[in-house]
């Protein structure tokens, strides 16, 4: 469907948010926006978040999600906080126009994440 | 109110051409991506070939069965969608709708190809 | 090509009975599914896109759900004008847009 763009690796930060720019070509002018992120796991699929947005509004998500996000034009930058090392995988973005129909749909490669946790600090002894 | 108008549908000999137009109004036309579905009687739906709209560069995509026979093209002035058919099997006899994205669907035309 | 295996292939059910249809993709379509309802002699009609949207003017009886490569249309309190055959369709690039094979409802 879509074509949507997302970079291949990123790497999360030592304090497990990673964030990555999603992209996708529009076919026409859509109004009302759905953006989800997909973790895959083998064959599994699971939701991590997802926020609708009307263009040129905040894209927003539930206050209790992990994830964070600002739109512009037919990018969106996409924030994942809370990760640790058993999060590595891939992270798919799905764009969805929702509103005025026809109803688009487009799938991105997926952005391989990469979490290490940090080490813990050593005792010190003065 | 959103109207797909097939037309071109007709009895035709194997080996033999036709061209089917579809005439859309009421909505965007060139925001949409078009297809063309057919139902062979008695059938399920096939879904027979696609174009895609400009910010797509008019891309299409054909299913296997009609790949090399058949030639989907579009008239973003006019609101028309053409669907050429080539080399016209028996197989090919089926109900012909087109659809805007796939939200729209036209009343379909009946296309009949035997000797 | 992904394949789009649909079942059962007809049922017969009585006013009133929840009805689900099942719709099995050969890979993975995250959530890239559409379902269609065609009445006897008539056109398509679209009811549920993206796995689990209705479509405008669809009655709140119908619903979709599912993701990754099951999904399932329900009519939660069968009508005799639900009587018809049902699609589900792939929408996930590349094409083809695969269709299930259908399911026909009929009333008990």
């Known amino acids: 469907a879509m074509h949507v763009a997302q970079p291949a690796v990123v790497l999360a930060s030592s304090r497990g948010i990673a964030s990555f720019v999603c992209e996708y070509a529009s076919p026409g002018k859509a109004t009302e926006v759905r953006v989800t992120v997909l973790r895959q796991a083998d064959s599994q699929v699971t939701e991590v978040c997802a926020a609708t947005y009307m263009m040129g509004n905040e894209l927003t998500f539930l206050d209790d999600s992990i994830c964070t996000g600002t739109s512009s034009g037919n990018q969106v930058n996409l924030t994942i906080q809370g990760l640790r090392a058993m999060d590595t995988g891939l992270y798919i973005c799905k764009v969805e126009l929702m509103y005025p129909p026809p109803y688009y749909l487009g799938i991105g490669n997926g952005t391989q994440i990469y979490v290490i946790d940090p080490e813990p600090c050593p005792d010190s002894d003065f | 109110e959103v109207q797909l108008v097939e037309s071109g549908g007709g009895l035709v000999q194997p080996g033999r051409s036709l061209r089917l137009s579809c005439t859309a109004s009421g909505f965007t036309f060139s925001d949409n991506w078009m297809n063309w579905v057919r139902q062979a009687p008695g059938k399920g739906l096939e879904w027979v070939g696609q174009i895609r709209n400009k910010p797509y560069n008019y891309e299409t995509y054909y299913s296997d069965s009609v790949k090399g026979r058949f030639t989907i093209s579009r008239d973003d002035s006019k609101s028309i969608v053409y669907l050429q058919m080539n080399s016209l099997k028996t197989e090919d006899t089926a109900v012909y709708y087109c659809t805007g994205g796939m939200d729209y669907w036209g009343q379909g035309t009946t296309v009949t190809v035997s000797s | 090509d992904i394949q789009m295996t649909q079942s059962p292939s007809s049922l017969s059910a009585s006013v009133g009975d929840r009805v689900t249809i099942t719709c099995g993709a050969s890979?993975?379509?995250?959530?890239?599914l559409n379902w269609y309802q065609q009445k006897p002699g008539k056109s398509p009609k679209l009811l549920i896109y993206g796995a689990t949207n209705l479509a405008d003017g669809v009655p709140s009886r119908f619903s979709g759900s599912g993701s990754g490569t099951d999904f399932t249309l329900t009519i939660s309190s069968l009508q005799p004008e639900d009587v018809a055959t049902y699609y589900c369709q792939k929408i996930l690039s590349p094409p083809p847009w695969t269709f299930g094979g259908g399911t026909k409802v009929e009333i008990k």
């Open positions: 890979e993975i379509i995250y959530g890239a």
